[in-house]
Interface confidence: low
């Protein structure tokens, strides 16, 4: 039977004053000689020679300083041998515990921790969790770390609290404002022995970035603007409207969207935002007509690309800026309106018979122009003549079979109105359907029942039946078609400048 005792030893100090640290004895020693032997870590395994035994008495001594963080306890395997080296007892496991001393400071997992938190966050919102460890004995005061914020920059007023036990950093209040401070730096101390004065400490830095929320309402630099724009023109940079917003530059919280509240019902204007400068560019995308409108009032508002933060939702009131637009008159001169007309010529019309009138309109007055002269432009088969003063179109001769066949029953020519003062020429398109001559020797073509109308932009064909009854003076029928867009689009009027 073994008789044993073992005392604990303390790390980091000379334990020899406690020797023997342990003692073993076998009751077999009563009637025979016993030799005691030990083995294990600290004896015959590294680190060697920490424990030695008096083989006769069984006293075990400790010979050197031990480190609990390396070896928290030693297991000494003990044997009692007779003179022939045979075991007298079952081998014994003797456990020697190493007592902890506070010889290790806390260690933060990072020298600098990075965190981020939205401005205006509620008090007690988690920002980050610091992590620190202490190599001393777990669940012991020597390894119990208490956290404390020791410095905050900017230091105006404390904004963060730390849970002394868990290292959680939370907001102290709901006053974080990125527009005031975009970043905070904290110094945090971790002290073992639960923050006791006799504890060891370490420090770390925490950089906390304050994230932007859309808590600033954008506003336009001016509350009113006055501009002038010429009629009939497009403008890609009519006015620059600068928006001020205190949120984070180039973010959706800062980027503005300027929109029309009223006044742009005709969609004449667009506002394009420059996302680098937060400047809105007012553009004219549809020409204005002075004759229809000499001035107009635009009302514009501004919001952000991103939704407003709930903290300012209730404060947002749509604040309109006014743009007073004056439309300037441009001397437009004459154009053919419509740009194309369709007439009918019948087989019994002869030389100098009137086909119809094609008169240029003065856009500034809306009346027939009095300042132009008319000439034929393209005149296939030399079919028509025009009165230079009145714009009256007449047949030069009775239509011949050769002319009819050449034209295939359809004529498309042009008339020019020339304003010598404005140095402007306008082109109109003349379409003529030449009617069948029945059994007359001069035609061998079927009756034609089609009209071509040309707006100057596209050609469309529409089927129409004609009344072929005529009169001797003006036997033509006129069909006209307005240009499709109805706007004063100079392209569709085929206006040319220069002599």
């Amino acid at each position: 039977e073994w008789i044993k005792f073992a005392a604990a030893c303390r790390e980091g100090e000379d334990n020899s004053k406690r020797n023997p640290i342990a003692k073993i004895h076998s009751d077999c020693a009563a009637n025979q000689q016993v030799t005691y032997r030990i083995s294990g870590v600290g004896i015959d395994q590294p680190p060697y020679g920490i424990f030695v035994i008096n083989q006769k008495t069984g006293e075990i001594n400790i010979t050197s300083i031990v480190d609990r963080e390396v070896t928290p306890f030693f297991i000494i395997y003990c044997r009692a041998l007779n003179s022939m080296g045979q075991d007298l007892e079952r081998p014994l496991e003797l456990r020697v515990r190493v007592l902890d001393i506070n010889d290790n400071p806390p260690v933060f997992s990072m020298a600098t921790f990075a965190g981020q938190i939205e401005e205006n966050s509620n008090a007690n919102t988690l920002v980050m969790i610091l992590n620190a460890t202490d190599a001393d004995e777990p669940n012991n005061l020597n390894s119990k770390i208490a956290f404390k914020i020791i410095r905050q920059e900017p230091s105006d007023s404390p904004m963060f609290i730390i849970n002394r036990n868990t290292g959680e950093i939370r907001t102290m209040n709901n006053f974080l404002d990125r527009e005031q401070y975009g970043q905070y730096a904290l110094a945090v101390r971790g002290s073992d022995r639960d923050g006791g004065a006799d504890g060891m400490s370490a420090e770390c830095e925490c950089n906390i970035k304050i994230l932007d929320v859309n808590d600033n309402i954008p506003y336009m630099e001016q509350s009113s603007y006055t501009i002038e724009i010429q009629e009939n023109t497009l403008n890609s940079n009519l006015l620059e409207i600068r928006v001020i917003d205190l949120d984070e530059e180039f973010s959706a919280n800062w980027m503005a969207v300027i929109f029309f509240i009223s006044g742009n019902e005709g969609n004449w204007f667009e506002i394009e935002m420059n996302e680098r400068t937060n400047v809105g560019i007012l553009k004219v995308v549809k020409p204005l007509d002075y004759e229809a409108m000499q001035s107009l009032q635009l009302s514009i508002g501004v919001r952000n690309k991103a939704e407003f933060h709930h903290s300012i939702m209730s404060q947002y009131k749509l604040k309109a800026s006014a743009i007073s637009v004056t439309v300037l008159n441009v001397i437009e001169g004459p154009v053919f309106r419509p740009g194309s007309k369709t007439y009918v010529v019948t087989g019994n019309m002869g030389s100098n018979d009137k086909v119809g009138d094609f008169v240029a309109t003065d856009l500034d007055t809306g009346r027939p122009s009095t300042t132009v002269r008319y000439v034929m432009g393209n005149n296939p088969a030399d079919l028509l003549a025009v009165d230079s003063r009145t714009g009256k179109l007449t047949l030069k001769n009775k239509v011949t079979k050769e002319q009819y066949n050449m034209l295939g029953g359809k004529y498309q020519g042009t008339i020019l109105s020339i304003d010598d003062n404005l140095q402007r020429t306008c082109t109109g398109t003349i379409n003529i359907n030449i009617q069948s001559f029945g059994n007359d020797d001069r035609t061998n073509t079927e009756p034609n029942t089609k009209i071509t109308t040309n707006t100057g932009r596209q050609e469309s064909t529409s089927s129409t039946n004609y009344d072929t009854s005529t009169t001797s003076t003006d036997s033509s029928q006129v069909y006209s078609s307005e240009p499709g867009n109805g706007a004063k689009d100079l392209l569709s009027d085929n206006v040319h400048f220069g002599p």
Epitope: K209, E249, F250, E275
Partner: antibody, heavy 118, light 113 residues
Framework: QVQLVQSGAEVKKPGALVKVSCKAS????????ITWVRQAPGQGLEWMGW????????KYAQKLQGRVTMTTDTPTNTVYMELRSLRSDDTAVYYC???????????WGQGTLVTVSS | ELVLTQSPDSLSVSLGERATINCKSS????????????LSWYQQKPGQPPKLIMN???IRASGVPDRFSGSGSGTDFTLTINSLQAEDVAIYYC?????????FGGGTKVEIK
């Protein structure tokens, strides 16, 4: 005026690393990002990645992940692109370019030829 | 990965004539939230870095002549050079920045006939 000036040509052995610099001037350095694009001889353009100078965020092309690192040095207005474990098919002209985000790169460096050859 | 396919590979156009380059995306680059097409066009001349000529698919970059125009939306885009000039000889690339990895088209080489 805005300028991006890149470091000079490099000749490297396979397995080595190369670090190309891109020095910016003429604008507020931290208001923009820098993207890196490379072009193998006679080939098209290949996007490598992008770094936000403002906050250091990076996005790398998947095929280069683990081999490429982009960093900034704000005091010197310089961006660096490091490519490790070089292979012969990394031979290319490497360009840096300025842009707010991942597109619309309005100013470019002159390019740096990196030749990988044993 | 979003693939951009340019056509034609090369284009030979007389001076003063129109050049048209197409770029087709394997999926849309139109971002619904802001209704913008995340597509740029770049011009690259031999020995030079690329030059931005068009962003958001149709907005000319500053200093780019108005003979260059961009159009299209979603997956199909076109770069048009009206009245080709000698200095327009280059390779033109479309590039999407809708999703990573950012990708370029294979390029279209424009030459004088």
């Amino acid at each position: 005026q805005v300028q991006l000036v890149q470091s000079g040509a490099e000749v490297k052995k396979p397995g080595a690393l190369v670090k190309v610099s891109c020095k910016a001037s003429g604008y507020t350095f931290t208001n923009y990002g820098i993207t890196w694009v490379r072009q193998a001889p006679g080939q098209g353009l290949e996007w490598m990645g992008w770094i936000s100078v403002y906050n250091g965020d990076t996005k790398y092309a998947q095929k280069l992940q683990g081999r490429v690192t982009m960093t900034t040095d704000t005091p010197t207005n310089t961006v660096y692109m490091e490519l490790r474990s070089l292979r012969s098919d990394d031979t290319a002209v490497y360009y840096c370019a300025r842009g707010y985000g991942s597109g619309n790169w309005d100013y470019w460096g002159q390019g740096t030829l990196v030749t990988v050859s044993s | 990965e979003l693939v951009l396919t340019q056509s034609p590979d090369s284009l030979s156009v007389s001076l003063g004539e129109r050049a048209t380059i197409n770029c087709k995306s394997s999926q849309t680059v139109l971002y619904n939230s802001d209704n913008k097409n995340y597509l740029s066009w770049y011009q690259q001349k031999p020995g030079q870095p690329p030059k931005l000529i068009m962003n958001w698919a149709s907005i000319r970059a500053s200093g780019v002549p108005d003979r260059f125009s961009g159009s299209g939306s979603g997956t199909d885009f076109t770069l048009t050079i009206n009245s080709l000039q000698a200095e327009d000889v280059a390779i033109y690339y479309c590039q999407q920045y809708y999703s990573t990895p950012l990708t370029f088209g294979g390029g279209t080489k424009v030459e004088i006939k």
